[in-house]
C-alpha cells in the first residue's frame, strides 16, 4: 500500500500521528471497530505530552482509549507494551469493580473528567479517539 503523508479531513495532526475525536458515544468494541474501519485504532497514549494533547482536545468528558484487559492482562490495541509504557490511572484504579450490577467487572480504560484513567464496563457509550500513524502503509491499493 501507499504511505499516508497527511491526515484525512477532520483529523488533527500531532507528532506524526493523526487523531479523530468523536462527538457521540459508543460501547468500547463499537468504537474499536469504528477506528479499524478508518484504518486506525483507538488512541494509544505513550507519553506525558501525548496525554496532554488528547486531554486538551477531549475536555472533561469520559472518553475511550485503546487499552483493555478483556483477555486477562492489560493490553494496548496496537501492541505497545503496557508494563513498561506510560500510565496515568486515577488513584485506586484500575479496580475491576463488580458492584455496578451490569454483570462482570471493568475491562476497558477511559479518560475521566480530569484526564486520568479509569477502568469501566466496556458497554458504556462513551466518546472515543481514533489514532493512526503518518508514514505507515495505508490499506488502500495504490493508484495505477
Amino acid at each position: 500500500g501507499s504511505e499516508r503523508t497527511c491526515c484525512p479531513v477532520n483529523w488533527v495532526e500531532h507528532e506524526r500521528s493523526c487523531y479523530w475525536f468523536s462527538r457521540s458515544g459508543k460501547a468500547w468494541a463499537d468504537a474499536d471497530n469504528y477506528c479499524r474501519l478508518e484504518d486506525a485504532h483507538l488512541v494509544v497514549v505513550t507519553s506525558w505530552e501525548e496525554q496532554k494533547f488528547v486531554q486538551h482536545h477531549i475536555g472533561p468528558v469520559n472518553t475511550w482509549m485503546g487499552l483493555h484487559d478483556q483477555n486477562g492482562p492489560w493490553k494496548w490495541v496496537d501492541g505497545t507494551d503496557y508494563e513498561t509504557g506510560f500510565k496515568n490511572w486515577r488513584p485506586e484504579q484500575p479496580d475491576d469493580w463488580y458492584g455496578h450490577g451490569l454483570g462482570g467487572g471493568e475491562d476497558c480504560a477511559h479518560f475521566t473528567d480530569d484526564g486520568r484513567w479509569n477502568d469501566d464496563v466496556c458497554q458504556r457509550p462513551y466518546r472515543w479517539v481514533c489514532e493512526t500513524e503518518l508514514d505507515k502503509a495505508s490499506q488502500e491499493p495504490p493508484l495505477l
Epitope: 506525558w48 496525554q51 496532554k52 506510560f86 488513584p91 484526564g115
Partner: antibody, heavy 118, light 107 residues
C-alpha cells in the same frame, strides 16, 4: 492543612552522595504525584524529577538522569531523592512539590539547601 | 526541550499600578502554562494554572491569559505584598521548564 517538609540537605564534596527526604502530611499522600524542583543561589527554578502516585512513571531532567533517583514510601508519607555523583552545579535549594493534575505544583515545601563543594 | 522566556526580567512599579508580565514558549504548549509567585527566601506559591485559572485563595487582581506560545500575567492594582519574583512554567511536556523569572520591585 497540607504540609511538606524537606530534610537531608547539607555540605557534601563533589562525587559524593546525599539523600533528601520530604515528609508529607495533611492530605492523602498516596493519591498525588510528587516532584523535586531546585533553585541555585540567585537563579531561577529548575525541575528535577517527578514520580506518579503509584510509582508507575518517573521522569528526570537530563541534567540529573542516571545520577538521581526519585522514590516514595506511601506507607510512611515520604518522598525521597537519592543524589549520587554530585557536582558543583547541583548546589541549590531543593523543594518537594505536590502535583495537582499532571505538572501543576499546588503545594511546596520550604526547601533544603544542598551545597556541593570541596 | 521547550524554552520559556519571560519579559521583562525585572520591573519597577508603584502600589496601585497595573503590571503585565509576558511569557513565551519556544513551541506550542496549548494552555499548559502556570504562574508562581516567590517572595524572598520563601517557596514559590501557585497563582494561575492552565493559563487562566485562578488558584483557590489567590486574590482576583491576578489574572492570566494566552494560549499556544504567548502568555501574560496581569496584576491589577499592585499591592505592597505583590512585590516578589514571578515564574512561568510549562507543564505540556517533560522536561518541565520554567522561565527565568521576573522581579517586581518597588519604584
Amino acid at each position: 492543612q497540607v504540609q511538606l517538609v524537606e530534610s537531608g540537605g547539607g555540605v557534601v564534596q563533589p562525587g559524593r552522595s546525599l539523600r533528601l527526604s520530604c515528609a508529607a502530611s495533611g492530605f492523602t499522600f498516596s493519591s498525588y504525584g510528587m516532584h523535586w524542583v531546585r533553585q541555585a543561589p540567585g537563579k531561577g527554578l529548575e525541575w528535577v524529577a517527578v514520580i506518579w502516585h503509584d510509582e508507575t512513571n518517573k521522569y528526570y531532567a537530563d541534567s540529573v538522569k542516571g545520577r538521581f533517583t526519585i522514590s516514595r514510601d506511601n506507607s510512611k508519607n515520604t518522598l525521597s531523592l537519592q543524589m549520587n555523583s554530585l557536582r558543583a552545579e547541583d548546589t541549590a535549594v531543593y523543594y518537594c512539590a505536590r502535583d495537582e493534575r499532571l505538572g501543576i505544583f499546588d503545594y511546596w515545601g520550604q526547601g533544603t539547601l544542598v551545597t556541593v563543594s570541596s | 526541550d521547550i524554552q520559556m522566556t519571560q519579559s521583562p526580567s525585572s520591573l519597577s512599579a508603584s502600589v496601585g499600578d497595573r503590571v503585565t508580565i509576558t511569557c513565551r514558549a519556544s513551541q506550542n504548549i496549548r494552555n499548559y502554562l502556570n504562574w508562581y509567585q516567590q517572595k524572598s527566601g520563601r517557596a514559590p506559591k501557585l497563582l494561575i494554572y492552565v493559563a487562566s485559572s485562578l488558584q483557590s485563595g489567590v486574590p482576583s487582581r491576578f489574572s492570566g491569559s494566552g494560549s499556544g506560545t504567548e502568555f501574560t500575567l496581569t496584576i491589577n492594582s499592585l499591592q505592597p505584598e505583590d512585590f516578589a519574583i514571578y515564574h512561568c512554567h510549562q507543564s505540556n511536556s517533560t522536561p518541565l521548564t520554567f522561565g527565568q523569572g521576573t522581579k517586581v520591585e518597588i519604584k
